[in-house]
């Protein structure tokens, strides 16, 4: 038995509006009906939880109302979008997937997506 495999892209560049999207795909060893997805950020030897959602297979992901994350699920794929990013939020974003129900419990952790965020240059004042 090895850890459950979780795949995610190596690098993503956030849009000029501070939005980054990536797919987190897991190889489910069983028929899970309840899945928990957590996005973690590792930077400067610190690890913080960005957001988390538990969903029932076939249903939508539901993040907390004040979460910076949104997402959709399709089979063993989760499409994650993180909003409100600024240059200081650049870092390694890791997808953690837990198969919560039915037993047995499984845990998988992706290799991380390096998200680069570049703050847009302010528009110069126009004379016109």
């Amino acid at each position: 038995c090895k850890a459950m495999h979780v795949a995610q892209p190596a690098v993503v560049l956030a849009s000029s509006r501070g939005i980054a999207s990536f797919v987190c795909e897991y190889a489910s060893p069983g028929k899970a009906t309840e899945v928990r997805v957590t996005v973690l950020r590792q930077a400067d030897s610190q690890v913080t939880e960005v957001c988390a959602a538990t969903y029932m297979m076939g249903n939508e992901l539901t993040f907390l109302d004040d979460s910076i994350c949104t997402g959709t699920s399709s089979g063993n794929q989760v499409n994650l979008t993180i909003q409100g990013l600024r240059a200081m939020d650049t870092g390694l974003y890791i997808c953690k997937v837990e198969l919560m129900y039915p037993p047995p419990y499984y845990l998988g952790i992706g290799n991380g997506t390096q998200i680069y965020v570049i703050d847009p240059e302010p528009c110069p004042d126009s004379d016109f």
Partner: nanobody, 127 residues
Framework: QVQLVESGGGLAQSGGSLRLSCAVS????????IGWFRQAPGKERETVSC??????SYADGVKGRFTISRDTAKNMVYLQMNSLKPEDTAVYYC??????????????????????WAQGTLVTVSS
């Protein structure tokens, strides 16, 4: 699936020693980091130490007093606790995390990365 069972908790005098054991089944040790965590009454669960195939890491409060080791032949991980203090009193948990290349000495023990948890064993240090 991975399962963990601890043993070795109990009562110790201040300055004394205890050795905790964590038996891992359902997998070899190599794909995982095995960590020890503790939770004192009314406090959050905190990192004590962790180990993978080539390095170990310790929380500042236990460096020099606690030693983590692993026996791959027996699929066991041990936490030798010396010079125990009353503030070491807590429920101790071993847990497993998939070992990842991006883990650093500072992050490989981070509780966010762990998901397979044992039931916990109580360590009480009396003064």
């Amino acid at each position: 699936q991975v399962q963990l069972v601890e043993s070795g908790g109990g009562l110790a005098q201040s300055g004394g020693s205890l050795r905790l054991s964590c038996a891992v089944s359902g997998s070899t040790l190599d794909p995982f980091v095995i960590g020890w965590f503790r939770q004192a009454p009314g406090k959050e669960r905190e990192t004590v130490s962790c180990i993978n195939r080539n390095r170990a890491s310790y929380a500042d409060g236990v460096k020099g007093r606690f030693t983590i080791s692993r026996d791959t032949a027996k699929n066991m991980v041990y936490l030798q606790m010396n010079s125990l203090k009353p503030e070491d009193t807590a429920v101790y948990y071993c847990a497993a995390s998939p070992d990842k290349a991006f883990y650093t000495d500072q992050t490989m023990c981070n509780i966010h990365y762990y998901g397979y948890w044992a039931q916990g064993t109580l360590v009480t240090v009396s003064s």
